[in-house]
């Protein structure tokens, strides 16, 4: 019975000489009982985050599919042999008789696989979205907590001011906000959260204790403290917050900086300064003055700046409201104007008036198309974005081109008048804009943007301050960004409010300047509130932003420069030469691959901006102290990250996607510094229950920790 009999398709083969090598038949019987080993079908690559059940289902379907494919292949072979007149054995005949069934099963299995893969992808998307939402909620909660800490620090700080104490006791409308007893309680609590240095304890132990007190206060625990409970203390603090006492401008005499109009002069030849020995902390002013505006968010309605999740934004977050056009820099083109650069010496000035003058001059420069985005607003398809990352985009979707080299403008120092009511803010750490731009548009046809700096040589004792930010924006990124419909384009540079372009002044004394840690979010597009679909543009904004902050007015070795760039790292590093055009001093550096994590002499930003003056290690970690004039002084330690990132080492955003723990480590080279100067009052003494000389560091516990990898 030539297997003839084999009805179940027993493999007997054709009538002719049996086909070689066991191409036996009937195995093809539909349904193929035994799962054949894999053939043709690639494994269903569905994603890393796949539920186990889904993986198993897809695995089974895949196996079945491969089996059926194999079977169908055999049947096709049998069919062909039959057509040639060859005799098949019973197993083969049985198999062939099931051809239609096998074909149907195969189609069904394919359809099933497609469905499950789609389902799997949906599940993954949902998981990702949920995770992202949870992450955002965590970050938002964290940010709110941080905000509360900052507010608390600000209030506690201000309570050292006799005038503030008196105001709070008297109240705004005769109704006392705080009693003497409550002030005393806050004074006592202040000593817990900013304790005197106890040399018997390790510093981090001491601050650990302080942080526990802060935490318990934020939690409003019923635990006893300072003769009361954290809950009571929290209520007292909240009462102060709710009184809006610190919001009213009469309490903060604002030093207003005059606005400066940029004089667009015709081309002026670059003046290349001669190389001369200069102090390490010298900066060159950029050659074009721009009018920009630094908006004090404390005086803006919170609701004006909300994320897609309608989160409330910390009132002290900084937001740039208007955008001036991008700075156009033609290769070897002359600078439109040559302002008289002012000098900023790296050390604190003895004369408060001079210091005020310096501060005002720098504050006037605080303009630039940066939107300081709070982290909780970032709902982005890719990995969670780091808080200390800046997102730079073209100003509108139609401008599809590389970003130019963007440089901070200089200010005419002689145009400044000392303002008597100004708070003496340390000049070493002044908020400066990272980017400025001219009023001229530029087109995509200009592939290279070379800086033109016309500055005079300065005597050594008058070094010129300049911060240059070079942002290299991959053309792919701008293209991707521009290709989105205007409605869904995250308008990072667009004006957020209807404030005029040139504001009448800058509030130097407002709370944010004294207490708010500015976090730059670069490379983090804000998805429009109504258009979650933009989240799907996965690779849209993963550009390489190499931000270079040079402290040299003259050209130096490139390797040295690379170690002196701001530690702002985002996305996947693209080190190709055509993506990075560095501007350094008055010379254009040849494009080259920048290290992703270079060292910076200005490694962090706080509300006072880039700390100036202290050489590395000179004054420690921005440990401010109040001198007799109650002016804030502080040094900083340039932070050198312990991780390297050569262009090929592949640091991507996922390295930093874990929820931030500000107390435990340093994020991305930004020193989380919360030491603040106070207002104008005299040194805090007896009212705070601490006799003796004024205490250094009347601010929050030092939160300057080192980055860990």
């Amino acid at each position: 019975m030539p297997s003839a009999t084999s009805h179940s398709g027993s493999g007997s083969k054709s009538s002719g000489p049996p086909p070689p090598s066991g191409s036996s038949g009937s195995e093809a019987a539909a349904g193929a009982g035994a799962a054949a080993p894999a053939s043709q079908h690639p494994a269903t690559g569905t994603g890393a985050v796949q539920t186990e059940a889904m993986k198993q289902i897809l695995g089974v379907i895949d196996k079945k599919l491969r089996n059926l494919e194999k079977k169908k292949g055999k049947l096709d072979d049998y069919q062909e042999r039959m057509n040639k007149g060859e005799r098949l054995n019973q197993d083969q005949l049985d198999a062939v008789s099931k051809y239609q069934e096998v074909t149907n099963n195969l189609e069904f299995a394919k359809e099933l696989q497609r469905s499950f893969m789609a389902l799997s992808q949906d599940i993954q998307k949902t998981i990702k979205k949920t995770a992202r939402r949870e992450q955002l909620m965590r970050e938002e909660a964290e940010q709110k907590r941080l905000k509360t800490v900052l507010e608390l620090q600000y209030v506690l700080d201000k309570l050292g001011d006799d005038e503030v104490r008196t105001d709070l006791k008297q109240g705004l409308n005769g109704v006392p906000i705080l009693s003497e007893e409550e002030l005393s309680l806050l004074d006592e609590f202040y000593k817990l959260v900013d304790p005197e240095r106890d040399m018997s304890l390790r510093l981090n132990e001491q601050y650990e204790h302080a942080s526990i007190h802060l935490w318990d206060l934020l939690e409003g625990k019923e635990k006893p403290v300072c003769g009361t409970t954290y809950k009571v203390l929290k209520e007292i603090v909240e009462r102060v917050f709710q009184s809006n006492y610190f919001d009213s401008t009469h309490n903060h005499q604002n030093g207003l900086c005059e606005e400066e109009e940029a004089a667009s002069a015709p081309a002026v030849e670059d003046q290349v300064p001669e190389a001369e020995p200069e102090p390490a902390e010298e900066y060159t002013e950029q050659s074009e003055v721009e009018s920009t505006e630094y908006v004090n968010r404390q005086f803006m309605a919170e609701t004006q700046f909300t994320s897609g999740e309608k989160e409330q934004v910390d009132e002290w977050t900084v937001e740039t409201v208007e955008v001036v056009n991008s700075l156009q820099q033609q290769p070897q083109a002359a600078s439109p104007s040559v302002p008289e650069p002012h000098s900023l010496t790296p050390v604190a000035q003895a004369d408060p008036l001079v210091r005020r003058q310096r501060v005002q001059d720098l504050m006037a420069q605080m303009q630039g198309p940066y939107n300081f985005i709070q982290d909780s607003m970032l709902d982005f398809e890719n990995q969670t974005l780091d808080p200390a990352i800046v997102s730079a985009q073209p100003m509108n979707p139609t401008q599809n081109m590389d970003m130019p080299q963007l440089v901070c403008p200089p200010v005419h120092s002689e145009s400044r008048l000392a303002q008597p009511n100004q708070v003496p803010v340390q000049p070493e750490a002044t908020q400066v804009p990272l980017v400025s731009s001219t009023s001229e548009g530029y087109t995509a046809s200009q592939p290279l943007y070379q800086p033109s700096h016309a500055t005079e040589q300065r005597p050594q004792k008058e070094p010129i301050d300049q911060i240059q930010a070079t942002i290299s924006l991959n053309t792919d990124q701008t293209t991707a960004s521009s290709s989105l419909p205007a409605a869904s384009q995250p308008q990072v540079f667009q004006a957020g409010t209807s404030k005029p372009l040139h504001s009448s002044g800058i509030n130097v004394n407002a709370a944010p300047f004294q207490s708010m840690q500015t976090v730059f979010n670069m490379n983090a597009p804000v998805p429009p509130v109504n258009e979650p679909e933009t989240l799907k543009q996965q690779n849209q904004y993963q550009a390489s932003y190499n931000q270079s902050f040079s402290s040299q007015p003259h050209q130096v070795e490139q390797t040295e420069l690379q170690q002196e760039q701001l530690q702002t790292v985002v996305g996947t590093y693209h080190g190709s030469p055509d993506q990075s055009h560095q501007v350094t001093g008055n010379h254009q550096q040849p494009p080259q691959q920048n290290t992703g994590f270079p060292r910076s002499n200005q490694p962090y930003y706080n509300s006072r901006g880039v700390s100036r003056g202290g050489s590395r290690g000179a004054r420690g970690l921005m440990n401010g102290y109040r001198g007799p004039a109650n002016g804030f002084r502080g040094g900083y330690d340039g932070y050198r990250p312990s991780f390297s990132n050569t262009p090929n080492s592949g640091y991507t955003q996922s390295q930093f996607s874990a929820p931030r723990d500000y107390s435990g480590y340093q994020r991305d080279g930004y020193q989380q510094n919360f030491k603040r100067g106070s207002g104008q009052s005299g040194p805090r003494g007896a009212p705070r229950g601490r006799g003796g000389p004024p205490r250094p560091n009347r601010g929050m516990p030092q939160m300057n920790t080192q980055q860990v990898n």
């Epitope: 019975m1 030539p2 297997s3 003839a4 009999t5 084999s6 009805h7 179940s8 398709g9 027993s10 493999g11 007997s12 083969k13 054709s14 009538s15 002719g16 000489p17 049996p18 086909p19 070689p20 090598s21 066991g22 191409s23 036996s24 038949g25 009937s26 195995e27 005799r87 098949l88 054995n89 019973q90 197993d91 005949l93 049985d94 062939v96 008789s97």
Partner: antibody
């Protein structure tokens, strides 16, 4: 239910003839099937006799069966036949019909004895 | 006719033992081979077709392998219900080169 039932067995004298039938039920003889006859002598192994392809009637025989045994089918009756001539004592066995090599009938006993 | 030689003709093994039966064809038959189990007084039951494919409903402890002239049938873990005689059969369609659907002599499997 698909099944095969053999009949026609019994006692026959040596040199005599016998015609075995195999009635198929549950499936039609019009399909692509090989129908076979297999026998098994008492206490011995299985021995293939012949097959016929229902579709076109092509047949094949074991060498020892050629000339004495004939396989045929009647598609209209859904029946398979085995004509045995010149029977010998050694032809005593249980005779099975099978469709392909998967479906077997229970068998019918043929005894050749004088 | 093609000749099929099966060995051993009988074997005795313990429950749980691995049992192997060989079948050799007098000429290459590719993979056109079936294995049967026959219990006393019953018709044979096919277990394996095309040398290695397990029939539906057959326990996975039964397996087959080989092609050409040498084939092997294995019971990975002998069970009491496996006591039977096992046969191999060439299932090729008769042709000028391969003729007949001969059976092997059978292997009687017993439990020790």
């Amino acid at each position: 239910e698909v099944q095969l039932v053999e009949s026609g067995g019994g006692l026959v004298q040596p040199g005599g003839s016998l015609r075995l039938s195999c009635a198929a039920s549950g499936f039609s003889f019009s399909g692509s099937y090989y129908m076979s006859w297999v026998r098994q002598a008492p206490g011995k192994g299985l021995e293939w006799i012949a097959y016929i392809y229902i579709g076109d009637g092509v047949t094949a025989y074991a060498n020892w069966a050629k000339g004495r045994f004939t396989i045929s089918r009647d598609n209209s009756k859904n029946t398979l036949y085995l004509q045995m001539n010149s029977l010998r004592a050694e032809d005593t066995a249980v005779y099975y019909c099978a469709r392909g090599n998967k479906l077997w009938g229970p068998g019918t006993l043929v005894t050749v004895s004088s | 006719d093609i000749q099929m030689t099966q060995s051993p003709s009988s074997l005795s093994a313990s429950v749980g033992d691995r049992v192997t039966i060989k079948c050799q064809a007098s000429q290459s038959i590719s993979s056109y081979l079936a294995w049967y189990q026959q219990k006393p007084g019953k018709a044979p039951k096919r277990l394996i077709y095309d040398a290695s494919n397990l029939d539906s409903g057959v326990p996975s402890r039964f397996s087959g392998s080989g092609s050409g002239t040498d084939f092997t049938f294995t019971i990975s873990s002998l069970q009491p219900e496996d006591i039977a005689t096992y046969y191999c059969q060439c299932t090729a369609v008769s042709s000028a080169t391969i003729y007949g659907n001969a059976f092997g002599g059978g292997t009687k499997v017993e439990i020790k």
